[in-house]
């Protein structure tokens, strides 16, 4: 807290300008009027104040706006945004996309901070919905933000936003989210050729249906085991041994190490042992020769 002292003669700030950077902390406190600061916030970010000085300016704004800053001030916070706590931000009512963009720009290139997460939450609550423009903005700055959305919220994500997504951004997505994202990715990348398409779609395949996996098996994609293990079990089960072999290519040997884990374990249980033996991997647990396979789900549907 800066001690309150009288402003030295001739130092009272008439406007926010670069001379203020050479003011000591107590001089900023004593000589800069909070109302002047608020009306000229756009100039503050153009002046490279130290964070110590920004602390003083924040204190002045906090005193002026104890219930939370108005959007006219928020939009021009610049580096001062980094000094805000989530508690400060919860007092704000941010409705302008331009304000959101301006503040996300300050944090660009860094992990999503608690401040940014709170800001986004406040913004979405203020708008009342996650519209296309908002999602475009958020996914442009934080592609990983997709995995923090519910499947319902994800349904309004435009396919064009998918282009910004990196594989690591989907690490925290669960299958329900990938179910929604996969069709969008398929649409976004539909004009790419085989190998390029696979590189892009690979991260989203946890939401792919059986028929798409069958189609990929015809394209010599050589899917790695890590990707295969993230596929939906219900999508893998109907695949034949030959289709899995084509899908994995040289990576098929990795099935042995994963034979006790889903979806490989469940898939093995559905295959004829004869067919599994053709892989030469020593996979065990398939349907013994001479056994008849009844599809009980089909039987239930008929009865």
């Amino acid at each position: 807290e800066v001690e309150k002292t009288a402003c030295p003669s001739g130092k009272k700030a008439r406007e926010i300008d670069e001379s203020l950077i050479f003011y000591k902390k107590w001089e900023l406190e004593a000589c800069v009027d909070a109302a002047l600061l608020a009306t000229q916030m756009d100039r503050v970010n153009a002046i490279p104040f130290t964070y110590e000085q920004l602390d003083v300016l924040k204190h002045k704004l906090d005193e002026l706006y104890p219930q939370g800053y108005p959007e006219s001030v928020i939009q021009h916070l610049g580096y001062l945004f980094l000094k805000m706590s989530p508690e400060d931000i919860r007092k704000w009512n941010v409705t302008s996309l331009e304000t959101l963009k301006a503040l996300l720009e300050v944090n660009k290139g860094h992990e999503m901070s608690p401040q940014v997460a709170t800001l986004i939450d406040r913004f979405v609550k203020g708008r009342g919905q996650l519209d296309k423009d908002t999602l475009d903005t958020l996914t442009a700055f934080y592609p990983g933000y997709l995995c923090s959305l519910s499947p319902e919220e994800l349904s309004s994500v435009p396919p064009s936003s998918i282009w910004a997504v990196r594989p690591q951004d989907l690490d925290t997505c669960d299958p329900r989210q990938l179910d929604v994202l996969y069709p969008k990715a398929r649409l976004a990348f539909q004009n790419m050729n085989g190998s390029e398409y696979f590189v892009k779609i690979q991260s989203f395949l946890g939401g792919a249906p059986t028929e798409d996996l069958k189609a990929l098996s015809q394209q010599n994609v050589s899917m790695d085991l890590a990707t295969f293990m993230k596929l939906r079990t219900d999508a893998v089960l109907p695949l034949t041994v030959a289709e899995v072999q084509k899908l994995l290519g040289p990576h098929v040997e990795g099935l042995k190490a994963e034979e006790r884990h889903r979806p490989v374990r469940d898939w093995i249980l559905r295959q004829r042992q004869d067919d599994l033996d053709t892989l030469g991997l020593g996979l065990q647990g398939g349907i013994p020769n001479g056994y008849l396979v009844l599809d009980l789900s089909m039987q239930e549907a008929l009865s």
Epitope: P48, T50, L54, Y79, L82, G109, H110
Partner: nanobody
């Protein structure tokens, strides 16, 4: 985190010159603005000069025309060229930086400049 080490201080006669250096290490890619401050014996610390990542710089009125600030981004080093030194320039000179990633100023340990005949 950014680490800063100042050097170049020493004893100099009035009217003499010194060049201070401040070497930055650590997450230097996040550095935005670099500053020189000084603290004279028994006085409070004051900002002497700064230079932004875009090359904009300025010096305090008390040293204008005598001190020049510059930075070499390739070497992650900040400089302060001090000419026509006076007794009142005697102080511990500190360099600090503002980064884009963490809202605190990072400081060096300081280098002593003594101007005396």
């Amino acid at each position: 985190e950014v680490q800063l080490v100042e050097s170049g201080g020493g004893l100099v006669q009035p009217g003499g010159s010194l060049r201070l250096s401040c070497a930055a290490s650590g997450r230097t890619s996040t550095i935005d603005t670099m500053y020189w401050h000084r603290q004279a014996p028994g006085k409070e610390r004051e900002l002497v000069a700064y230079v932004t990542s875009r090359g904009t710089s300025n010096v305090a009125d008390s040293v204008k025309g005598r001190f020049t600030i510059s930075r070499d981004n390739s070497k992650n080093t900040l400089y302060l060229q001090m000419n026509s030194l006076r007794a009142e320039d005697t102080a511990v000179y500190y360099c600090s930086v503002r980064t884009t990633s963490y809202p605190v100023d990072f400081w060096g340990q300081g280098t002593l400049v003594t101007v005396s005949s």
